[in-house]
Amino acid sequence: VPQKPKVSLNPPWNRIFKGENVTLTCNGNNFFEVSSTKWFHNGSLSEETNSSLNIVNAKFEDSGEYKCQHQQVNESEPVYLEVFSDWLLLQASAEVVMEGQPLFLRCHGWRNWDVYKVIYYKDGEALKYWYENHNISITNATVEDSGTYYCTGKVWQLDYESEPLNITVIKAPREKYWLQ
């Protein structure tokens, strides 16, 4: 049975600033690189037929659901892209994480401007601070890491706060063992 294709992002963030670039790639088993990929944005078929969909100079209209399909194989699970205009944007490697998997958080400054005194918060409590911008890395996520995250920082000497982001860590499914 052919596997469903999977959409991956490069850079890996599904929340980006207006004007930034992101490449969506339709990955699957033994798919030909010829023009055989269908891309769907908010349900509408895109003109792009390559296995990669490049979003250059992102606009707000680029926000939404993306799916891909190779030949007549099942559609991929959807990936949701959101385009923002703000001073700070909290980006996560994933918003739903399987327990035991890594989780990375990034407090991204508009136009890649320097951000100082960056503090990450979880459920309203400070998680970690540093004098310059820095990332948060959780090697093995646990259910306790679920929560609402945001970051604050200084850009051009002024204080800003990102929009909050809900992160959910789900328990890994139990392996099923069948007695012979």
Epitope: Y116, K117, V118, I119, A126, L127, K128, Y129, W130, Y131, E132, H134, G153, K154, Q157
Partner: antibody, heavy 120, light 111 residues
């Protein structure tokens, strides 16, 4: 009262190992960076390294990288400075100090210092 | 990472003002608004007197003030008093891997 209390003075021989401690109280120990500072007799302050007890993220001064190990134990609200093989040149006063917090720059709470003497 | 450069000694009479300089580079003092100042009396632990270039902890006298221009930070002690006689150190952020580097030490003498 916010304070850092350091372990007592140590007299050691060259080649011996040592671990000194710094216990925090009166604040959320895991939420502030803790730095270590060396002061050799009659000399100035030298920054050695810093640790965030919340996740044990550690940064070392290039001068001390590989010479010492900085660690922390959340359950004990303590930070540690360790040597595997002491040298006579390690004779100094060692201070731990807490960062101001919130990304503000400075060390606002200091331990009383631990005197380490290394002599054969 | 080289230490920041401070004058070895500065002196003044009671009631006078003195200024201690702390010279860095465009990669530390010149780049970041992260400078702190410490006072150390003989046999005592250092004490924070200025953080974030100009900010004073609440318990520190307003006779202590600080500023920064280019690659140089300065600490001014006004209305000099006998208890101000001590060693003074500046510190600056240099990089994420080396956040603290101290100055060379200035001995303040009250004449």
């Amino acid at each position: 009262e916010v304070q850092l209390v350091q372990s007592g003075a140590e007299v050691k021989k060259p080649g011996e190992s040592l671990k000194i401690s710094c216990k925090g109280s009166g604040y959320s120990f895991t939420s502030y960076w803790i730095g270590w500072v060396r002061q050799m007799p009659g000399k100035g302050l030298e920054w050695m390294g810093i640790i965030y007890p919340g996740d044990s993220d550690t940064r070392y001064s290039p001068s001390f990288q590989g010479q010492v190990t900085i660690s922390a134990d959340k359950s004990m609200s303590s930070a540690y400075l360790q040597w595997n093989s002491l040298k006579a040149s390690d004779t100094a006063m060692y201070y731990c100090a807490r960062d101001v917090g919130n990304g503000d720059y400075g060390l606002d709470v200091w331990g009383q210092g631990t005197t380490v003497t290394v002599s054969s | 990472q080289s230490a920041l450069t401070q004058p070895a000694s500065v002196s003044g009479s009671p009631g006078q003002s003195i200024t201690i300089s702390c010279v860095g580079t465009s990669g530390d003092i010149g780049r970041f608004n992260y400078v702190s100042w410490y006072q150390q009396h003989p046999g005592r632990a250092p004490k924070l007197i200025i953080y974030d270039v100009t900010r004073r902890p609440s318990e520190i006298s307003n006779r202590f003030s600080a500023s920064k221009s280019g690659n140089t930070a300065s600490l001014t002690i006004s209305g000099l008093q006998a208890e101000d006689e001590a060693d003074y150190y500046c510190s600056s952020y240099t990089s994420s891997s080396t956040p603290y580097v101290f100055g060379t030490r200035t001995k303040v003498t009250v004449l």
